[in-house]
Interface confidence: low
Amino acid sequence: DWVVAPISVPENGKGPFPQRLNQLKSNKDRDTKIFYSITGPGADSPPEGVFAVEKETGWLLLNKPLDREEIAKYELFGHAVSENGASVEDPMNISIIVTDQNDHKPKFTQDTFRGSVLEGVMPGTSVMQVTATDEDDAVNTYNGVVAYSIHSQEPKEPHDLMFTIHKSTGTISVISSGLDREKVPEYRLTVQATDMDGEGSTTTAEAVVQILDANDNAPEFDPQKYEAHVPENAVGHEVQRLTVTDLDAPNSPAWRATYLIMGGDDGDHFTITTHPESNQGILTTRKGLDFEAKNQHTLYVEVTNEAPFVLKLPTSTATIVVHVEDVNEAPVF
């Protein structure tokens, strides 16, 4: 019959060329000499000359290697005419399907991917996604099926498997507990994309994971004990500056200190504010002290942060002994 089943041709064929693919044959050749020709893109229209046909035998020829990524399917028409040029058959559809070879390696869409995750998160938390593409066929073959993996992690602390990557989606997740910004603020992962679903060509990219600060460090007084001297009757007088250290990210709500007088100020004589730059607690007199009434005050000050703690942390307390100094007051009549 004047019919040709779809022809499969692997791309990148080594030849030798021209290569015989299939034979067109009309049963009208019993009655008359038949001349065969082909038309369509790849034959007589661009890209011209990829295919040809032997006029008398009907052999369909491939003249050069094919590239599936350029053209995956050719649709040609076969023609049969008699010696006098009269058509002896209707034009026949010839489908040539170019089958894939693994001739492209995966390519990451970026050289460097960036993501972030909060310190202390639970294993299973998603961080970011990396993407690689492969021009090869991922539908009918594994040539274009990309599998992702993590090749290396820097630094390797607290150990070298802090993250995992989903083989097929490229989603990077936390796999281990122990992310601590104060110890490791950033991880650099070398990620790989390998075609053939992990068995073929490999390419690499970098994934940078920034560890975001959580309020997992309490501010601590340093020192914890202070002695101060204040003249009696002075209002708004700076009594003492209290210093704290906090390992969380400077100038963030997790670092900024909030001070509270917890005890020893029964008469509400003192107030404490936070210095906006140094984070120190500035203890001042709210109203005048009376040496004759009480010559020493022992204050207990607690420090927390503007942001709540993300886990239960001990609160640091400072003790300030304030000595009230006598001032020679005019006699009262």
């Epitope: 990148n12 080594k14 693994n102 001739d103 492209h104 390519k107």
Partner: antibody, heavy 121, light 107 residues
Framework: VQLVEESGPELVKPGASVKISCKAS????????MNWVKQRPGKGLEWIGR????????KYNGKFKGKATLTADKSSSTAYMQLSSLTSEDSAVYFC??????????????WGQGTSVTVSS | ELVMTQSPASLSASVGETVTITCRAS??????LAWYQQKQGKSPQLLVY???TLAEGVPSRFSGSGSGTQFSLKINSLQPEDFGTYYC?????????FGAGTKLEIK
């Protein structure tokens, strides 16, 4: 296919840099690797590295990292190699050579005529 | 890096003779071996790739064979234009490496 190394013989002073060009014609420049090969006088061939002009990907022989920098200009179908901090050891003929991208496992089928670089004060 | 060991380093032969040059790879390179011919002052020319495929325009008196780590290039009925230096090259793994060359001289 033709690869023409347009720069003539180069005479350069130690410590200087030189940039060699290789103009391609007769094939899809972007879709083939361009390799660079060094040949010292009377010596054998030494592979420096290659570039895929399509996306600029480069691969270097470790020995030439920091010495050679490969670039390509798709618009003019020209590949370039810059050699820096030149010493007498860099005096050689440098060839560009095309490599078709069948998984980059192909031989170098077309070569430029070579550019002679002489480093001398 | 992969080392390509070529032998002999030099060879004298007469027109009409048959010569064989061998090349050994320090690791398996399957069939990814090329042979080049270089004449004095000229660029190398590809003769054979994939161990045994003749490059376009190369006379059939040249033939390549081998796979894995052992390869050879055979030239039948030497012609005057065949004299020069021959190099083998691994085109499997980077850095691509060449043999040290075999200088074929006229006797």
């Amino acid at each position: 296919v033709q690869l023409v190394e347009e720069s003539g013989p180069e005479l350069v002073k130690p410590g200087a840099s030189v940039k060699i060009s290789c103009k391609a014609s007769g094939y899809a420049f972007s879709s083939s690797w361009m390799n660079w090969v060094k040949q010292r006088p009377g010596k054998g061939l030494e592979w420096i590295g290659r570039i895929y002009p399509g996306d600029g990907e480069t691969k270097y022989n470790g020995k030439f990292k920091g010495k050679a920098t490969l670039t390509a200009d798709k618009s003019s179908s020209t590949a370039y190699m810059q050699l820096s901090s030149l010493t007498s050891e860099d005096s050689a003929v440098y060839f560009c050579a095309r490599q078709r991208d069948y998984g980059a496992l192909y031989a170098m089928d077309y070569w430029g005529q070579g550019t002679s670089v002489t480093v001398s004060s | 890096e992969l080392v390509m060991t070529q032998s002999p380093a030099s060879l004298s032969a007469s027109v009409g003779e048959t010569v064989t040059i061998t090349c050994r790879a320090s690791d398996d390179i399957y069939s990814y071996l090329a042979w080049y011919q270089q004449k004095q002052g000229k660029s190398p020319q590809l003769l054979v790739y994939n161990a045994k495929t003749l490059a376009e325009g190369v006379p059939s008196r040249f033939s390549g064979s081998g796979s894995g780590t052992q390869f050879s290039l055979k030239i039948n009925s030497l012609q005057p234009e065949d004299f020069g230096t021959y190099y083998c090259q691994n085109h499997y793994v980077t850095p691509f490496t060449f043999g040290a060359g075999t200088k074929l001289e006229i006797k």
